[in-house]
Interface confidence: low
């Protein structure tokens, strides 16, 4: 990996640890978020039986959670670095409204929910630094997001619990797919 501007590879104090490359930094950030999601899922699963529920499809119809598809260029077959990076950033931007929804959904893991939200923002910024084609990235409409948030918060308790479970599961899957794809870049 190239040495960052203003840096010289001989300047490191401990030869066994070079500065993290951009890719390593992103990799670490995703793993940190995945750790946070695991903690949140633990609370969700302990609190309700949503994790074993077979009625996920009922709630999933109300959500439009980002998913990786073949056309996004993130899978090994048909891998396309630029298309995939745009999809990852766009997907993360779309997840932000759902992460906002999660903020009041946890009791013992409130701090963890905040950490997942904030570190996702940081991850987006790292990825934007990496992206060459920022124009291709569509930012979600704030008005649409606001009304979606209101709609989600107006659901009954069962649907709110299910929505929380689905957001965490989908976000985990999206990040895991992103992690695999980014390791090819």
């Amino acid at each position: 990996a190239p040495v960052p501007p203003g840096e010289d590879s001989k300047d490191v104090a401990a030869p066994h640890r070079q500065p993290l490359t951009s890719s390593e930094r992103i990799d670490k950030q995703i793993r940190y978020i995945l750790d946070g999601i695991s903690a949140l899922r633990k609370e969700t699963c302990n609190k309700s039986n949503m994790c074993e529920s077979s009625k996920e499809a009922l709630a999933e119809n109300n959500l439009n959670l980002p998913k990786m598809a073949e056309k996004d260029g993130c899978f090994q077959s048909g891998f396309n670095e630029e298309t995939c990076l745009v999809k990852i950033i766009t997907g993360l931007l779309e997840f932000e409204v759902y992460l906002e929804y999660l903020q009041n959904r946890f009791e013992s893991s409130e701090e963890q929910a905040r950490a997942v939200q904030m570190s996702t923002k940081v991850l987006i910024q790292f990825l934007q630094k990496k992206a060459k084609n920022l124009d291709a990235i569509t930012t979600p409409d704030p008005t649409t997001n606001a009304s979606l948030l209101t709609k989600l918060q107006a659901q009954n308790q069962w649907l709110q619990d299910m929505t929380t479970h689905l957001i965490l599961r989908s976000f985990k899957e999206f990040l895991q797919s992103s992690l695999r794809a980014l390791r090819q870049m």
Partner: antibody, heavy 119, light 107 residues
């Protein structure tokens, strides 16, 4: 070489607003995030937030959400921070600092702008 | 927010001494820690980043180490020009927080 030139000292009354500037030179302004940091006399450093000059996206320490507004003018390579509803607690030196390439460390700092809030 | 507890607050040393400053994070920050030097009347300067990496042009008497929550900054042989306040900072997660600072004075 990289330089961040900040605007001069400000004297403001409680309740007023101030806007300070940070002019960047010696590097591509839009490539690096710009952080703002507060330092009260004889005290430590407090991270306020940063702006991505390329997109205008900014993120804040929650404590400063309603206090600070960050903007950037790409044509003049200048970052701005506006502080509103000033109180004596806002009296401090404010630094702009360039985000390092490899993380959210600040590798180049401006000389600081001293803000004094007094009636 | 992650709290960075820095000790000691003051250090009075002689030129040639070895100096150690510690910073304890309230939760793991991996190795996303930096150390800054602020000389009287000046802006802070980045010395160490990612826990143990010296920034370009920083003398090798300055070193950093750590283990996720406990971080150490060392000046192997203090020189007169090292008179300054030293700060640690975590950038593991926002808001990025600084330690309270250590004022180094030379006898």
């Amino acid at each position: 070489q990289v330089q961040l030139q900040q605007s001069g000292a400000e004297l403001a009354k409680p309740g007023a607003s101030v806007k300070m500037s940070c002019k960047a030179s010696g590097y591509t302004f839009t490539t690096y995030w710009m952080h703002w940091i507060k330092q009260r006399p004889g005290q430590g450093l407090e991270w306020i937030g940063y702006i991505n000059p390329s997109t205008g996206y900014s993120e804040f320490n929650q404590k400063f959400n309603d206090k600070a507004t960050l903007t950037a003018d790409r044509s003049s390579s200048t970052a701005y921070m506006q502080l509103n509803s000033l109180t004596s607690e806002d009296s401090a030196v404010y630094y702009c600092a360039r985000d390092a390439y490899y993380g959210n460390y600040e590798d180049y700092w401006g000389q600081g702008t001293t803000l004094t809030v007094s009636s | 927010s992650i709290v960075m507890t820095q000790t000691p607050k003051f250090l009075l040393v002689s030129a040639g001494d070895r100096v150690t400053i510690t910073c304890k994070a309230s939760q793991s920050v991996s190795y996303d820690v930096a150390w800054y030097q602020q000389k009287p009347g000046q802006s802070p300067k980045l010395l160490i980043y990612y826990e143990s990496n010296r920034y370009s042009g920083v003398p090798d008497r300055f070193t950093g180490s750590g283990n996720g929550t406990d971080f150490t900054f060392t000046i192997s042989t203090v020189q007169a020009e090292d008179l300054a306040v030293y700060f640690c900072q975590q950038v593991y997660t926002s808001p990025y927080t600084f330690g309270g600072g250590t004022k180094l004075e030379i006898k």
